[in-house]
């Protein structure tokens, strides 16, 4: 009796304690992106960046996926969104087209049941880069918590993306999942 | 019979919910440190910042571990680090070695097991700052989405240490974890 | 007798369910609030932000509070609190008082328990806006992860507040609950 | 690669320039360093020129030693060397740590 | 600045060696370690305290923070015979010299 009732609760306790764990994995999806510079293009206007490792290096992804350079929704909730772009010139890469330039990112939704896109977050500055310094060096940063549904798409968009700074450490964005919608 | 079972239910449910509640709060680690501006050193050389604060003001820390002036993870995990590191420079202070400047920051990763370290973000900028202003400031701000092994650790270098603002509302890098490894 | 058990034990797991769940959801405040710019104060000072949205494009708020232009805590915990600030310039909006400007953001905490008002978290740049350029921009991020008590007030501070980037994309501050206070 | 050129045997008082050629890697992301070691002695640091062109120097060699830069070169220059500063001279870089070294360029001072 | 001892050791092949440096001001784990052999440049062996360089053998340990650091070599062999400095990359104002005196290792 007592005892069989016991046994019946510690397996109550085992079997949640699994759920539980279990549960609270699969509900927290994530990703960290970096930048895949094989493929920046050239130019000084705004480009959506297409080219971005998900399984190398410090890049991860889990229950969500990336498909055709954008980073897609799989579970609905509240996600805090960032974003990390350096961008350098060095003068042995050439003289830049312009020493006026405006480095900027924009973190971007898609939500394909409504074909429309709209920038959640912006960053950058506008810089003068002179031929009086041989290197120049920016980065941004930007962050910010955002409720996602299932299917939609992040991406991110760039001005001056020739200039990008290919490094993992340099160029990246991700998200991950806080809490779920009420 | 049925009574008995209640209030063993009832033990259950109470336990559980102080072992959930307990378990939730000791599998959290955090930590948010702000520099201890007594013994910044000169140059414009990139260093190591190894004198943090973990227990005064805002600084503080749970289940991970502040030695040698790392950060040591404790637990396995996905955690979401970031920093904010602020220079600045006032025309009473001297004048600057060179008008032309990188302010830059790593945050890096050491495994101890294999002794290697690796960045995982960067961020900065080159800067003009030039003597017809008598003060400048510049704030650079990372964050990003890692996963830890328990006894990697992380750490701050920073380029032109001399230009730290020693404030611990400027000058400060953390860790929170988020979720466990699958 | 066993049938009974098994019945009530499958109750205990699925109330043990929602309450997880349910607790889980309110355990989680959280704020994203965008600038309301019809009301952004003008002059170079160092002012107070008082007008933000909370129900409207990206801007949301549960189980926390914002009145009198403050965010309001409601539950103890662990908060990571963020904030980005844009400021632009365009030559149409008629000339700079001052070419060289400090851009500045603090983000800070009021109890008012202990009417004392300190800040959290600093960042910005000294600029210099020449005439020579017809447009200038210029971002801040920071964020940073704090212990927040049921009460405490959390408010933004700007200079040159008549800068400010009108955009929910690119002004705008938030915060989440990470983890309870042990 | 690092490579020291310009030493010589030199007489007292007189100028010398030393120069350091970079090859393999972008003098922008380093600082670059001079190192001396007397014959049977010990390493000394003289001071770098960072990636803005800033100076620092060793407290014994301010006022003593000038570093300047192009954009593949570093140059050293001792004015009114004395015989103590007959020595190897090493350029490096980066200050922390010294990771490439130069083979060295011998300086003797003596009238 | 840095203070380093012994000036001199002799150690037999496969003993092992301590080599000990001492900060005049606490410079954290910014301390690197180097090897030089007669005629040649100086060559890194560890930097930031403990990590060691790229090709360079695992009997090289480096330990110690603030101000007090251990070179420790295991094994040793033949080939290790040669002066050891360590220098902290710390602070390069208003230092005279950033390199410790040296420590000649002689292999029997």
């Known amino acids: 009796g007592s005892q069989h009732i016991r046994a019946e609760k510690a397996m109550v306790d085992g079997s949640w304690l699994d759920l539980a764990k279990r549960s609270k994995l699969e509900a927290q999806p994530f990703a960290h992106l970096t930048i895949n510079a094989t493929d920046i293009p050239s130019g000084s206007h705004k480009v959506s960046l297409s080219s971005w490792y998900h399984d190398r290096g410090w890049a991860k992804i889990s229950n969500m996926t990336f498909s055709n350079g954008k980073l897609i929704v799989n579970q609905d909730g509240f996600y805090y969104l960032y974003a990390n772009i350096c961008f350098r010139h060095h003068e042995t890469s050439g003289d830049l087209a312009t020493e006026y330039l405006q480095l900027m990112v924009y973190v971007t939704k898609t939500s394909i049941k409504i074909p429309s896109s709209h920038t959640l977050m912006k960053g950058g500055s506008t810089k003068y880069w002179s031929g009086n310094s041989e290197f120049h060096f920016y980065s941004i940063n930007v962050g910010g918590f955002f409720k996602l549904r299932s299917g939609e798409e992040i991406s991110i968009e760039v001005s001056n993306p020739s200039l990008l700074d290919p490094d993992q450490d340099a160029t990246y964005f991700g998200a991950f999942k806080v809490r779920d919608i009420d | 019979g049925s009574q008995h079972i209640r209030a063993e239910k009832a033990m259950v449910d109470g336990s559980w919910l102080d072992l959930a509640k307990r378990s939730k709060l000791e599998a959290q680690p955090f930590a948010h440190l702000t520099i201890n501006a007594t013994d910044i050193p000169s140059g414009s050389h990139k260093v190591s910042l190894s004198s943090w604060y973990h227990d005064r003001g805002w600084a503080k820390i749970s289940n991970m571990t502040f030695s040698n002036g790392k950060l040591i993870v404790n637990q396995d995990g996905f955690y979401y680090l970031y920093a904010n590191i602020c220079f600045r420079h006032h025309e009473t202070s001297g004048d600057l070695a060179t008008e032309y400047l990188q302010l830059m920051v790593y945050v890096t990763k050491t495994s101890i097991k294999i002794p290697s370290s690796h960045t995982l973000m960067k961020g900065g900028s080159t800067k003009y700052w030039s003597g017809n202003s008598e003060f400048h400031f510049y704030s650079i701000n990372v964050g990003g989405f890692f996963k830890l092994r328990s006894g990697e650790e992380i750490s701050i270098e920073v380029s032109n240490p001399s230009l730290l603002d020693p404030d611990q509302d400027a000058t400060y890098f953390g860790a929170f974890k988020v979720r466990d490894i699958d | 007798g066993s049938q009974h058990i098994r019945a009530e034990k499958a109750m205990v797991d699925g109330s043990w369910l929602d309450l997880a769940k349910r607790s889980k959801l309110e355990a989680q405040p959280f704020a994203h609030l965008t600038i309301n710019a019809t009301d952004i104060p003008s002059g170079s000072h160092k002012v107070s932000l008082s007008s933000w949205y909370h129900d409207r494009g990206w801007a949301k708020i549960s189980n926390m509070t914002f009145s009198n232009g403050k965010l309001i805590v409601n539950q103890d915990g662990f908060y990571y609190l963020y904030a980005n600030i844009c400021f632009r310039h365009h030559e149409t909006s008629g000339d700079l008082a001052t070419e060289y400007l400090q851009l500045m953001v603090y983000v800070t905490k009021t109890s008012i328990k202990i009417p004392s008002s300190h800040t959290l978290m600093k960042g910005g740049s000294t600029k210099y806006w020449s005439g020579n350029s017809e447009f200038h921009f210029y971002s801040i991020n920071v964020g940073g992860f704090f212990k927040l008590r049921s009460g405490e007030e959390i408010s933004i501070e700007v200079s040159n507040p008549s800068l400010l980037d009108p955009d929910q994309d690119a002004t705008y501050f938030g915060a989440f609950k990470v983890r309870d206070i042990d | 690669s690092l490579e020291e050129s310009g030493g010589r045997l030199v007489k007292p008082d007189e100028t010398l320039t030393l120069t350091c050629t970079v090859s393999?890697?972008?003098?922008?992301?380093?600082?670059i360093n001079w190192v001396r070691q007397a014959p049977g002695k010990g390493l000394e640091w003289i001071g770098y020129?960072?990636?803005?062109?800033g100076t620092w120097y060793a407290s014994w060699a301010k006022g003593r030693f000038t570093i300047s830069k192009t954009s593949t070169t570093v140059d050293l220059k001792i004015t009114s060397p004395t015989t103590e500063d007959t020595a190897t001279y090493f350029c490096?870089?980066?200050?922390?740590?010294?990771?490439?070294w130069g083979p060295g360029t011998l300086v003797t001072v003596s009238s | 600045d840095m203070t380093q001892t012994p000036a001199s050791v002799e150690v037999a092949v496969g003993g092992t060696v301590t080599i000990k440096c001492q900060a005049s001001?606490?410079?954290?784990?910014?301390l690197a370690w180097y090897q030089q052999k007669p005629g040649q440049p100086p060559k890194l062996l560890i930097y930031?305290?403990?990590t060691v360089a790229s090709g360079v053998p695992s009997r090289f340990k480096g330990s110690g923070f603030g101000t007090q650091f251990t070179l420790t070599i295991s094994g040793v062999q033949c080939d290790d015979a040669a002066t050891y400095y360590c220098?902290?990359?710390?602070?390069?104002?208003?230092?005279?010299?950033?390199f410790g005196g040296g420590t000649e290792v002689v292999v029997k």
């Open positions: 001001q606490n410079i954290g784990s910014n």
């Open positions: 490096t870089r980066k200050y922390n740590p010294m990771d490439l």
């Open positions: 020129i960072d990636v803005g062109s």
């Open positions: 220098q902290q990359g710390y602070s390069a104002g208003n230092v005279n010299n950033p």
């Open positions: 393999g890697f972008s003098l922008y992301n380093y600082e």
């Open positions: 930031s305290t403990s």
